[in-house]
């Protein structure tokens, strides 16, 4: 009923709650002496559905048959209209349209932990649009029963507040949920289970790891579980990995030995529990334990390379380079590298520990046979030493690789190719491809890169420390026993025309010709490997085309003679540089007048 309804009544038949698709009869009737003043036939009763007029009638009552009402609540209001006055509200009624509840589906119950409480969930089915009450019933052995009711409009979960006991894990319990509203009722199929079926253990806690004698091979994982746990799943992975290793264990009783962990690796460990081999469900995964495994002595051997540089008639500089061991080979934090230098005939040896660097430079006599050994040490020991006999790597001309080429291969890669040496190619034990940024001064501090290639390979893709628009000096060594041969080439991964031309710093006259000297283009402006320099000249104030001389680029060259200038003529000279991509802009212009006699 809506409002006080002092002036009349609205009745609804068959009921205020109806099944979707049903018809209702709505009657609005005035109480005695509540109509318009004097004339009853002047009473105009109007029926509204919400705020829309759907019917009217003159008299004391109005009947209306309504069909097609939508799901949910519809409000009907009856009003009285008299001549020369506003409509007066008489009474109203709400009609509730819905459906009987569907059979609840997929009833399932769970108890979280041995001491948790039994809670059940189900699917309600389609919305009834009506007030619907759900009753969950649990019956156990010996006529034990519990009931819980839920009056929430969207009820699909109830907790009984009791826990099943492990004392009789085989005892059967049956749950059933019944939905009731004004239009009908429906019960789920019963769900029968035992303690073991529905108890989902709490995840294990207090997870710890112990390494006996600080060794990764003696590792035990410990944890605490609820008392009835029979099965555990362990999963673990290196912290930087997405893939888990899985182990299933039975009757572990809170401990398990792990045999396949890698040294010096941070791992993440998680454990899950289950009460029975084929009944019940797994617990959630435990919180993660993160732990680093202990170090073990390094495995593998360092990749060592070297460079020799002539200093004077009696001395040579040896620069040793080595690559870091991989994480799996280092098996710990490398504390230092041990370098041993030995003269093989006289037996003299010196050992040095190098910290924080992967290179070492020393000066040794040019005489004698020298060898080096390099190893890496962590807190547990040292790797096997890599031994190298120091030799002249390019001495054997017949071992020099032939037809060496270097071509750009995609972004920041250079493909180096070669042909085997003329000397019996089967004598080659390995090739070493070495590259470093080209610095005109031949700077020995420039980092050296290298890779080793098997003797049957005739190409190598170099990508480590390769930058765009930088020229690299690339050498290919063929090694055979205590001999080596080498060939070199310049290469870049990406190039464009140089940003500037060379700067002419001096022009000098020598016996009727001139010698032009220039400063090298700064490395960052070369934009790749230079192929040529061009020297241009023309008579001052002349509109004629300049003459030019093209000089192949050589790293150390920074001067060149020109002998085709006329005496006592003032010339303007400038230079450009070229890469495979094109020519630079002009360098500076210099004027020069040759003083010598005319030919």
């Amino acid at each position: 009923k809506i409002d006080a309804c002092k002036r009349g009544d609205v009745t609804v038949k068959p009921s205020h709650v109806i099944l979707l698709g049903s018809t209702v009869n709505i009657t609005c009737s005035l109480k005695p002496r509540q109509g318009c003043f004097h004339y009853s036939r002047r009473n105009k009763l109007i029926l509204y559905k919400f705020d829309r007029r759907i019917n009217f009638h003159h008299g004391h009552s109005l009947n209306s048959q309504v069909t097609g009402l939508p799901l949910g609540t519809t409000l009907f209001v009856c009003k009285l209209a008299c001549i020369n006055s506003d409509e007066i509200q008489i009474c109203g009624a709400e009609i509730f349209v819905g459906v009987a509840p569907e059979q609840p589906q997929n009833l399932s119950c769970i108890q979280k932990g041995e001491q948790g409480t039994v809670a059940c969930t189900w699917e309600r089915g389609r919305d009834t649009h009506l007030y619907t009450e759900y009753t969950l019933q649990l019956s156990g052995p010996k006529n034990l029963t519990w009931q819980k009711q839920c009056k929430d409009i969207y009820c699909d979960y109830l907790d009984f507040g009791i826990n099943l006991t492990p004392e009789s894990p085989e005892s059967n319990f049956t749950a059933k949920v019944t939905a009731v509203n004004s239009l009908g009722s429906s019960s789920s199929l019963p769900s029968t289970f035992t303690f073991l079926d529905i108890v989902r253990p709490l995840p294990p806690w207090d997870i710890r790891i112990k390494f006996q004698k600080a060794s990764v091979s003696r590792c035990t994982l410990y944890w605490r579980d609820e008392g009835l746990v029979l099965l555990n799943r362990l999963r673990y992975r290196p912290s930087n990995s997405r893939l888990w290793n899985m182990v299933n264990v039975t009757k572990a009783k809170g401990r398990h030995d792990l045999l396949d962990l890698k040294p010096f690796t941070e791992y993440e460990f998680q454990i899950s529990s289950k009460l029975h081999l084929y009944k019940g469900s797994w617990s959630d995964w435990s919180e993660s334990l993160r732990a680093q495994t202990p170090e073990e002595e390094p495995t593998g051997m360092l990749d060592v390379w070297y460079m020799k540089r002539h200093i004077d008639y009696s001395r040579q500089q040896i620069s040793l380079f080595w690559k870091n061991l991989s994480v799996s080979e280092a098996r710990g934090k490398i504390l230092h590298y041990q370098v041993t230098l030995q003269e093989l005939t006289g037996g003299k040896a010196m050992t040095q520990n190098i910290t924080g660097h992967t290179s070492w430079t020393t000066v040794i006599p040019r005489t004698g046979n020298w060898a080096v050994a390099v190893s890496a040490a962590n807190s547990k020991g040292s790797s096997l030493p890599t031994r190298i006999n120091i030799m002249n790597l390019c001495e054997a001309g017949l071992l020099a690789p032939r037809q060496v080429s270097a071509n750009s291969e995609g972004m920041d890669n250079i493909l180096v190719t070669w042909q085997p040496p003329r000397k019996d190619p089967s004598a080659v034990q390995e090739y070493v491809v070495e590259w470093r940024e080209l610095h005109p001064g031949g700077d020995t501090q420039v980092p050296l890169n290298w890779l080793r290639s098997r003797p049957y390979n005739v190409s190598a893709l170099i990508s480590e420390n390769i930058k765009s628009y930088i020229c690299y000096e690339i050498r290919v060594y063929a090694l055979s026993g205590d001999q080596g041969g080498c060939s070199s080439i310049l290469g870049n991964s990406k190039h464009k025309a140089p940003l500037s031309g060379p700067h002419i710093n001096a022009i000098t006259e020598e016996k009727g010709s001139i010698l032009i000297s220039w400063n090298s283009i700064p490395v960052q402006e070369q934009m790749g490997c230079l192929l040529h320099y061009r020297i241009y000249w023309k008579e001052r104030d002349s509109n004629s085309q300049p003459q030019l001389c093209e000089i192949p680029y050589r790293v150390s060259q920074n001067s060149h003679p020109i002998n085709s200038l006329q005496p006592r003529v003032t010339y303007v000279l400038w230079m450009t540089a070229l890469t495979a991509a094109g020519e630079s802009s002009h360098g500076n212009e210099r004027e020069f007048c040759l003083q010598g006699k005319a030919n």
Partner: antibody, heavy 116, light 107 residues
Framework: EVLLVESGGGLVKPGGSLRLSCAAS????????MNWVRQAPGKGLEWVSS????????HYADSVRGRFTISRDNAKNSLYLQMNSLRAEDTAVYYC?????????WGQGTLVTVSS | DIQMTQSPSSVSASVGDRVTITCRAS??????LAWYQQKPGKAPKPLIY???SLQSGVPSRFSGSGSGTDFTLTISSLQPEDFATYYC?????????FGGGTKVEIK
């Protein structure tokens, strides 16, 4: 009618062994957990051990763990308690009992006396 | 382990009296408590399971109540055959434990 009958009790010296048996009838033995409960002369009841229907779950009181072993043979409808390293304080009447939300059926008991 | 404490340890009463025995658990045990009656030289007889449910064949003068930690066994009108020792037992978790017993004697 549910019936549980214990046997195997007797006099034994400290450090000795005994094996108790419980013969069950009148119910589906393989569907129930079974227990041993004991009562020392003039004392209260003390739970000793439990075994689940398919022997997956076995529990012992701290006082007997490591010395007593519970087992069952569902084909023979029988429950057993192997008692080793017996002590004077193990002297008691030993009952076998069925589990169903408590101990709902008990045997008549068998007396075990440990004395030198 | 869950300790079960029964009180009183003994009670003297007459036929027709109402007798109440209490049992307290050291931690919550939900409703998983059983009561037993034992007469000298006999095996215990189950009376009540799940705190308040009567085992079949047990007279209705026996009733149980409580949940969590506090439980009560009530004999509404004591009969001559009720003079015995009564034990409570928790069936909530292992190890299963009994109360110390309450002896009901004739006054």
């Amino acid at each position: 009618e549910v019936l549980l009958v214990e046997s195997g009790g007797g006099l034994v010296k400290p450090g000795g062994s005994l094996r108790l048996s419980c013969a069950a009838s009148g119910f589906t033995f393989s569907s129930y957990s079974m227990n041993w409960v004991r009562q020392a002369p003039g004392k209260g009841l003390e739970w000793v051990s439990s075994i689940s229907s398919s022997s997956d779950y076995i529990h012992y009181a701290d006082s007997v763990r490591g010395r007593f072993t519970i087992s069952r043979d569902n084909a023979k409808n029988s429950l057993y308690l192997q008692m080793n390293s017996l002590r004077a304080e193990d002297t008691a009447v030993y009952y076998c009992a069925r589990s169903e939300l408590g101990f709902d059926y008990w045997g008549q008991g068998t007396l075990v006396t440990v004395s030198s | 382990d869950i300790q079960m404490t029964q009180s009183p340890s003994s009670v003297s009463a007459s036929v027709g009296d109402r007798v109440t025995i209490t049992c307290r658990a050291s931690q919550g045990i939900s409703i998983w408590l059983a009561w037993y009656q034992q007469k000298p030289g006999k095996a215990p007889k189950p009376l009540i399971y799940a705190a308040s449910s009567l085992q079949s064949g047990v007279p209705s003068r026996f009733s149980g109540s409580g949940s969590g930690t506090d439980f009560t066994l009530t004999i509404s009108s004591l009969q001559p055959e009720d003079f015995a020792t009564y034990y409570c037992q928790q069936a909530n978790s292992f190890p299963l434990t009994f109360g110390g017993g309450t002896k009901v004697e004739i006054k």
